[in-house]
Interface confidence: medium
């Protein structure tokens, strides 16, 4: 059987492709955040709903996946997913003096609705999430504000109003929240006096001004001949976390990269054996990206249907029938400056009853892909496409 990592990387790609289809501009999201939120949902689902969700986070090798599985195998697979996510969260959450990386999970439940103690015990065990009762029935907007203020507190006030006015109502029974907050300093700082205004080319004809940072230093680097692109790894202090930038040679070369990209290739390109230490003249724009997605249609496009239907089986979460995912909000925020990065993501799932990145020149003055990877856990914290300042 393959690990969570392979399926999660495939899932990342599927998500990215779907988000890219519907978003002309930038794309930015947290695969770890979304996977964690889905893990918390899997804990509470049973039957076909659970199987469907499990498939996006876990794959089998060979033909085994095509045969009908026994209930015991399904349970074993489910436990393996949660165990791996638990290990991932533990690894990621290890304290560091060099950066802040905080993943937070919380459940906000309608105070009169009854959630299974087993679900609450397990969600705390695997995801360090607690349940906070709120009054959706009589004070939905007050509850919404309470949830939003918790998200703000977990993301250093970078993610505000995750749930907009009117998005939660008296029929909301559970809001499942995952936030990922990262603030790091570059291992080799860009000097502010080297930052200059330059053109960033959206395509061959259109450009926008950006503040372009510059640094000539030793980085993990390689040419990707088949893709006509370069990849550079920019480490943060203590090298635990790096931002990788995948830059096409041509201004309009990003589409070709995305067509040829695969989860296996991504793993291969970023592996220590593939990259080599080179002197690189890196020109990287100061970035500020903020994206909000309703992931429901995106997840439906990658094969998750029943979790959002009124026939969803959430019987592992509650004894009450009719519980289903109402929406799946994901907001992510990224700032890249000379000192380093600040990145956050908030994922919220609202449940209602049928009734939440001489010298080699790497000049990032045209659309590129980037991702922030945690080395020890080999997980992608954030993934994005920067195509419009």
């Amino acid at each position: 059987m393959d690990s969570l990592g392979t399926a999660a990387t495939q899932f990342l790609f599927d998500l990215f492709k779907e988000l890219n289809k519907t978003n002309d501009g930038n794309v930015f999201f947290s695969p770890v955040g979304i996977s964690t939120a889905i893990g918390m949902i899997i804990l509470g689902t049973r039957g076909a709903t659970a199987s469907e969700l499990q498939k996006v986070l876990y794959t089998e090798q060979g033909t085994e996946s095509s045969r009908i599985k026994s209930e015991e195998e399904e349970i074993e697979k489910r436990e393996e997913i949660h165990h791996q996510l638990q290990m991932l969260l533990t690894e990621i959450s290890k304290f560091s003096n060099d950066y802040d990386l905080i993943i937070s999970n919380r459940l906000f439940g309608e105070k009169t609705y009854l959630f299974l103690q087993k679900y609450i015990d397990y969600v705390e065990k695997y995801y360090h999430a607690s349940l906070e009762p709120v009054d959706f029935v009589n004070a939905a907007d007050e509850s919404r504000k309470k949830i939003n203020s918790w998200v703000e507190s977990q993301t250093n006030v970078k993610v505000k109003d995750l749930f907009p006015e009117g998005s939660l109502n008296s029929s909301t029974k559970l809001v499942l929240i995952n936030t990922v907050y990262f603030k790091g300093l570059w291992d080799r700082e860009f000097k502010k006096e080297h930052t200059k205004e330059e053109d960033f080319w959206l395509n061959k004809n259109l450009s926008k001004p950006v503040q372009m940072m510059a640094l000539c230093s030793s980085f993990n680097f390689t040419f990707l001949e088949d893709l006509q692109a370069k990849i550079v790894g920019i480490p943060y202090k203590n090298n635990d976390i790096s931002m990788f930038v995948l830059l096409p040679n041509d201004i309009d070369g990003l589409e070709k990269i995305m067509d040829k990209m695969s989860p296996e290739k991504l793993v291969e390109w970023t592996s220590p054996g593939h990259l080599e230490q080179r002197r690189v003249d890196l020109r990287l724009p100061r970035l500020q990206v903020e994206e909000t997605y309703d992931l429901e249609p995106v997840l439906e496009a990658v094969g998750i249907h029943s979790a959002f239907s009124e026939h969803a089986d959430y019987s592992g979460m509650s004894a009450r029938s009719g519980l289903h995912a109402q929406n799946f909000l994901h907001r992510s925020f990224l700032v890249v400056t000379e000192e380093g990065v600040e990145a956050t993501a908030g994922t919220g799932v609202g449940l209602k009853v049928s009734s939440a990145a001489s010298c080699e020149l790497v000049h990032c003055n045209h659309p590129f892909l980037f991702f922030i990877r945690h080395r020890e856990s080999d997980s992608i914290l954030f993934f994005g496409k920067f195509s419009s300042p």
Partner: antibody
Framework: QMQLVQSGGGVVRPGGSLRLSCAAS????????MSWVRQAPGKGLEWVSG????????GYADSVKGRFTISRDNAKNSLYLQMNSLRAEDTALYYC?????????????????????????WGQGTLVTVSS | ETTLTQSPGTLSLSPGERATLSCRAS???????LAWYQQKPGQPPRLLIY???SRATGIPDRFSGSGSGTDFTLTISRLEPEDFAVYYC????????FGQGTKVELK
Amino acid sequence: QMQLVQSGGGVVRPGGSLRLSCAASGFTFDDYGMSWVRQAPGKGLEWVSGINWNGGSTGYADSVKGRFTISRDNAKNSLYLQMNSLRAEDTALYYCARESSMTTVTTYLLREVGVGLDFDYWGQGTLVTVSS
Amino acid sequence: ETTLTQSPGTLSLSPGERATLSCRASQTVSGSYLAWYQQKPGQPPRLLIYGASSRATGIPDRFSGSGSGTDFTLTISRLEPEDFAVYYCQDYGSSRTFGQGTKVELK
């Protein structure tokens, strides 16, 4: 279909012992906390004892504390009530009931079984008569 | 421990009539964690209402619950022949207590 089938009732002398069983089917037994509730002849309902989903936490009414022991075997989808030092006032129809589970942070943190719980499915009941 | 007092003790009504059953708590029922059960002779209780006003799965909409704090009401809008039974309220917020019951009998 969901079922709770009870057994083990009968007539016993004061000071005697009895073990009640409740076999569950039609639902994932180890997802749920379970309770025993009794009803004396012609009287109302009284919560007796409760156990959480994995058996790690139990609770008892003051009237049975030290005499009764609740347990479960998730592998067998079964709930038990071991009743020792029985008294005449223990005479009642005993029901096993599935708990809808917790609602409040307080009860969750305190792990007080039986508090913050209602009962959504009940067994058919088994009569326990304590008489000399 | 909370004491629940149900009234009246007995309610004599005809099919089609409206039944109003009261449950008063000696102290505030935290979070409106009050449930109503129906029990027919020789049968176990059946959950009707939880959270003071939410109908349990499969319960007809003629049954409704209301109230908060210390005063709660179960209303059966139009009595059906199968509704004649004993009704119990339960405080499941801060204690494990049940009321003594209200019998709804055929007039």
